[in-house]
């Protein structure tokens, strides 16, 4: 028998520095978690203690904090190289800055293989990107070899900016021939490493012949055997065992997100490469694990540029950006309109000739807007200004909801109107009319939404049974501000980009902004 230790991370999302328990900015260092310096300490400890160790990442290192905004992926390559990762799979967010934003900072700089078997380059890109990412890689581990085959969510063209010269194939269809190839190369221990979410991970384990272990990402799934060490609630045991169609027991793992845990899986193989046993658990990277001093010093060196960036001008406003609670929690406010417009703009993806865009709607809880921006300061808008508007470090996510769920959400928006509560919705691509003289739960008298399957966008009445795509804060997707119906009824949820980054990118792109209050939210006569 031969034992392999798989250490794995996924969905780190730019958390290079330690964070608070909820993965936001670290406030009280004695209670902070994660970060690459602490991760390195634990990885080195395990490498010293155990003979056959692989350190793998299942994608979405990109996007999530100012680190990515400023360094654009160079920080990922640098610190992953420093930690001596053995392989990484491409996630959807690796394409957020286009293919160039993946090739230059990461693919060309990484000293470890970056993998995806279901992404195929075509046209002029094919030769440019050739060899920079691979479908699979055979890694020597001790006296043995292990094959790692990569995969990426086929939804990436809807979630990021991979351009038109990359084709995202079905994961299972693309993986099988690559696994077969590895088998012909006499590689009998094969790990599928990828970024398509837990449901697809389980399907791969079930359907792809020859895959021994699946290490996944994208769905931020927390698995744990026994008593969990922090506030994450396990979606199942670690490892999650799937019985494959050919009768094998295939362990599937994921390690939540944000570098809070290091996945730790021990696999025992027999001489024919069959999995005899698998066990382990994610390791909580809390303050009992010291931060490695040399990596920490490097982090501090790289940090300097971030502090300078915060005060640089991103663009200008020639109007007052009203982010006051008096406005945004009671009526349409132009700060809400600006943020929603930025959210839609960030999700422009022309992937189908029938659609001008795949999503046209945005909702945003007014309570999430926490500051105005005064145009009389020379009109200057900085990252620092935006951090005051959006201080909670969330993401703007893509969900799919039925029209009936959206109607419930808008009823909830005004169910206790007038108390300065945060659930009052700011919108984009939506026209809503409320009648506050009616009883709570029956106050939405008109709800029109911007069409997507059209060449000239126009507003049509919401259809209760239709499925709509909506951009919204992760806070709402998780049921925050009482929006339980969104959490309970959403049909799909893909995590998006850092909120401040979305707005800052939009302002930089527009250069000068002048959002108006333009009748997106109205109150019918006699009720307001």
């Amino acid at each position: 028998a031969w034992e392999l230790t798989i250490l794995h991370t996924n969905d780190v999302h730019s958390r290079l520095e330690q964070t608070s328990e909820d993965s936001s900015k670290c406030v009280n260092a004695s209670r902070c978690m994660g970060g690459v310096a602490r991760l390195f300490t634990k990885v080195q400890q395990i490498r010293r203690a155990e003979p056959n160790v692989l350190l793998l990442d299942a994608g979405d290192q990109y996007q999530g904090t100012i680190w990515f905004t400023v360094y654009k992926g160079a920080e990922v390559a640098h610190f992953m190289n420093a930690l001596r990762y053995d392989a990484m799979a491409l996630g959807n967010h690796e394409f957020d800055n286009g293919v160039e934003g993946l090739i230059e900072p990461l693919l060309k700089e990484a000293k470890f293989p970056i993998l995806s078997a279901n992404i195929k380059a075509k046209g002029p890109l094919a030769s440019q990107i050739s060899g920079l990412y691979l479908p699979y890689k055979v890694l020597p581990v001790g006296d043995e070899v292990v094959g790692i085959v990569g995969y990426t969510s086929k939804e990436t063209p809807f979630l990021s900016n991979p351009g038109t010269n990359l084709v995202f194939e079905d994961e299972i269809t693309a993986l099988q021939p690559e696994v077969d190839k590895l088998k012909t190369l006499n590689v009998n221990k094969i790990i599928a490493l990828g970024h398509s979410g837990f449901e697809m991970d389980k399907l791969i384990a079930q359907k792809v012949r020859g895959v021994d272990v699946v290490v996944g990402g994208h769905s931020n799934t927390f698995l744990y055997t026994g008593n969990p060490p922090s506030k994450e609630v396990p979606a199942g045991k670690y490892p999650f065992i799937v019985t494959s169609d050919d009768g094998r027991k295939v362990p599937v793992v994921q390690a939540y997100a944000f570098g809070k845990y290091l996945g730790y899986l021990k696999i025992e193989f027999d001489e024919r490469g069959n999995v005899i046993s698998s066990h382990g658990n994610p390791i909580l990277l809390n303050s009992s694990i010291p931060e490695d001093p040399s990596i920490k010093a490097d982090i501090n060196k790289w940090r300097i540029k971030l502090d300078n960036y915060s005060t640089q001008e991103l663009g200008k406003t020639i109007v007052y950006l009203d982010g006051s609670s008096q406005s945004c929690r009671f009526r349409e406010c132009n700060m809400g309109n600006l943020i929603c417009d930025a959210m839609i703009n960030n999700n422009l993806r022309h992937t189908d000739e029938m659609f001008w865009n795949h999503v046209s709607m945005c909702i945003l809880n007014g309570g999430g807007i926490r500051s105005p921006i005064d145009e009389r300061n020379n009109g200057t808008i900085t990252w620092e200004n935006l951090a005051a508007v959006l201080p909670f470090g969330g993401t703007f996510d893509l969900v799919q909801l039925k029209g009936s769920t959206l109607k419930k959400a808008f009823e909830h928006s005004v169910h206790r109107y007038g108390q300065s509560t945060g659930e009052f919705l700011q919108v984009g691509g939506i026209h809503v009319v409320y009648d506050l003289s009616r009883k709570p739960g029956d106050r939405v008298v008109k709800l029109d939404v911007l069409c997507t399957k059209c060449r000239v966008p126009s507003y049509d009445p919401l259809k209760m049974d239709e499925v709509y795509k909506v951009i919204l804060p992760n806070f709402l997707a998780n049921g925050g501000d009482g929006f339980q119906m969104i959490k309970d009824e959403l049909l799909r949820h893909d995590s998006g980009d850092q909120d401040i980054n979305v707005v800052s990118t939009y302002i930089s792109k527009m250069k000068v902004i002048y959002p108006a209050v333009e009748g997106r939210i109205k109150f019918s006569t006699g009720s307001h």
Epitope: D22, V27, S324, S325, Q326, R329, R370, S371, P372, A388, P391, F392, H415, R416, Q419, S420, G479, G480, G482, Q484
Partner: antibody
Framework: VQLVESGGGLVQPGGSLRLSCAAS????????MHWVRQAPGKGLEWVAV????????YYADSVKGRFTISRDNSKNTLYLQMNSLRAEDTAVYYC??????????WGQGTLVTVSS | IQMTQSPSSLSASVGDRVTITCRAS??????LAWYQQKPGKAPKLLIY???TLQSGVPSRFSGSGSGTDFTLTISSLQPEDFATYYC????????FGQGTRLEIK
């Protein structure tokens, strides 16, 4: 995150007192702020709230018209001006951020005693 | 909106499973929080939005309910859990329950 209340003490019925709450370790101007009180040996009673930018204020019926909540975001400080004090206002007064939400932090309290 | 907690006091032993209930005088959706308070200390938030565990709070604490009836459960009492517990609604201007004193049997 730290919230430090001050300004409590002994005051006669009908008198006035101004409580302060100095905040540090977080972006004070981003948070709604509350005052909550607790009479000796009794339960918690919510007193007042002010939105992050000062544009919305709400009060418990028991203090309406007598107490005024205010804030100075440039000084990271929350205030409670208490007028026409009564014996039943005797309590430990706590300031707190966004109660009943993720960003919920409380100070250690300051004691106000209304007695002749 | 009035909040009624029961029981007002409760004796239990380390390792016990304990349940405290809270009833609102009208529907409050999931706008309910649970606090723990020890003598001479400020209250500490345990649960918000009826069932969401606050960061740093042990997983033995859990909350459930929606509308008018809510429950705080401590799955296995630890010595440090003996304290007074309050529910609080934030559907309208905040209002606390009268408290439940949990003491050692």
């Amino acid at each position: 995150v730290q919230l430090v209340e001050s300004g409590g003490g002994l005051v006669q019925p009908g008198g006035s007192l101004r409580l302060s709450c100095a905040a540090s370790g977080f972006t004070f101007s981003s948070y709604d702020m509350h005052w909550v009180r607790q009479a000796p040996g009794k339960g918690l009673e919510w007193v007042a709230v002010m939105s992050y930018d000062g544009s919305n204020k709400y009060y418990a019926d028991s203090v309406k018209g007598r107490f005024t909540i205010s804030r100075d975001n440039s000084k990271n400080t929350l205030y409670l001006q208490m007028n026409s004090l009564r014996a039943e206002d005797t309590a430990v007064y706590y300031c707190a951020t966004e109660i009943a939400a993720k960003g919920d932090y409380w100070g250690q309290g300051t004691l106000v005693t209304v007695s002749s | 909106i009035q909040m009624t907690q029961s029981p007002s006091s409760l004796s239990a032993s380390v390792g016990d499973r304990v349940t405290i209930t809270c009833r609102a005088s009208q529907g409050i959706s999931n706008y309910l929080a649970w606090y723990q308070q020890k003598p001479g200390k400020a209250p500490k938030l345990l649960i918000y939005a009826a069932s969401t565990l606050q960061s740093g709070v042990p997983s033995r604490f859990s909350g459930s309910g929606s509308g008018t009836d809510f429950t705080l459960t401590i799955s296995s009492l630890q010595p440090e859990d003996f304290a007074t517990y309050y529910c609080q609604q934030s559907y309208s201007t905040p209002h606390f329950g009268q408290g439940t004193r949990l003491e050692i049997k």
